[in-house]
């Protein structure tokens, strides 16, 4: 699914938006939704939002999780509401390596 070329009139999805980039908004509209987790001086920082342009999220969503960053992407209205990105656990295979979910 990820390698599909974007359509001329791509479908837009409503996504939960949480984090600094959201300002006072609690939602956004885009071609993909995401849920991310990064580490800032030992603390987990969770963010949710949307990629308004397909190309914007294409590489990000394909990136496998690293010890300091994980992103999960999905397509579907509010599909990122109940997604909490997880960092890979040492010595365990990480189930969401592809990090892409269709709803």
């Amino acid at each position: 699914m990820e390698d599909e070329k974007p359509k001329v009139n791509p479908k837009l999805y409503m996504c939960v938006c949480e984090g600094l980039s959201c300002g006072n908004e609690d939602h956004c509209e885009g071609q993909q939704c995401f849920s991310s987790l990064s580490i800032n001086d030992g603390f987990h920082v969770y963010q949710k939002g949307c990629f308004q342009v397909y190309e914007q999220g294409k590489m990000t969503c394909k990136t496998p999780p690293s010890p300091g960053q994980a992103v999960e992407c999905c397509q579907g209205d509010w599909c990122n509401r109940n997604i909490t990105a997880q960092l890979p656990t040492k010595g365990k295979s990480f189930p969401g390596t592809q990090n892409f979910h269709l709803e």
């Epitope: 949480e18 580490i39 030992g42 603390f43 969770y46 909490t84």
Partner: antibody, heavy 116, light 108 residues
């Protein structure tokens, strides 16, 4: 295997001081924030304080602000809680916890009793 | 601060029954920042659920979490004898981090 081992608890008089330690092993200590959580006898859990991985940021519950100081020595993989001006209501089991956000690993706890 | 109110205070059930525990926040909490713990007498708490619905490592699938905003739920689909304990919710969305007062699940 992640292990957290608290020490330093004991009986202290009101107004006294105590320093708790937590020796950590089994993970890259400096990469994770750490917390102290306490539990008074027969009561629920109360978050006390947290410190970032580098030690540069610290956070406290209002009930201990100005009296307790959290710190860490990443070269020794050890977390500390300096408790001053202790009160009877500080009597509790004190747990250290690995806590980048939620508390995924806990120590066994050390009992602090503040009584005259 | 965000106050978490758990209900009921005590839940009296028999093994095999379903347990539904509630955690209500005084203000909206992102689901990514809500966790549940189990504590048995004389033991340290154990992480069960994080991100409102993700099970921690080694937690049986009879434990599930759900909810968003101000209302969160922990469900134990079929109580096993070892599940009788006290359960706490916790938010790490805003400082100070806070716990609910706990729900005791006891044998009926």
């Amino acid at each position: 295997e992640v292990q957290l081992l608290e020490s330093g608890g004991g009986l202290v008089q009101p107004g006294g001081s105590l320093r708790l330690s937590c020796a950590a092993s089994g993970f890259t200590f400096s990469s994770y924030a750490m917390s102290w959580v306490r539990q008074a006898p027969g009561k629920g859990l109360e978050w006390v304080s947290a410190i970032s991985g580098s030690g540069g940021s610290t956070y406290y519950a209002d009930s201990v602000k100005g009296r307790f100081t959290i710190s860490r020595d990443n070269s020794k993989n050890t977390l500390y809680l300096q408790m001053n001006s202790l009160r009877a209501e500080d009597t509790a089991v004190y747990y250290c916890a690995k806590s980048a956000s939620f508390f995924d690993y806990w120590g066994q706890g050390t009992l602090v009793t503040v009584s005259s | 601060e965000i106050v978490l109110t758990q209900s009921p205070g005590t839940l009296s059930l028999s093994p095999g029954e379903r347990a539904t525990l509630s955690c209500r926040a005084s203000q909206s909490v992102s689901s990514s920042y809500l966790a549940w713990y189990q504590q048995k007498p004389g033991q340290a708490p154990r992480l069960l659920i994080y991100g409102a619905s993700s099970r921690a490592t080694g937690i049986p699938d009879r434990f599930s979490g759900s909810g968003s905003g101000t209302d969160f739920t922990l469900t134990i689909s079929r109580l096993e004898p070892e599940d009788f304990a006290v359960y706490y919710c916790q938010q790490h969305f805003r400082w100070p981090w806070t716990f609910g007062q706990g729900t005791k699940v006891e044998i009926k």
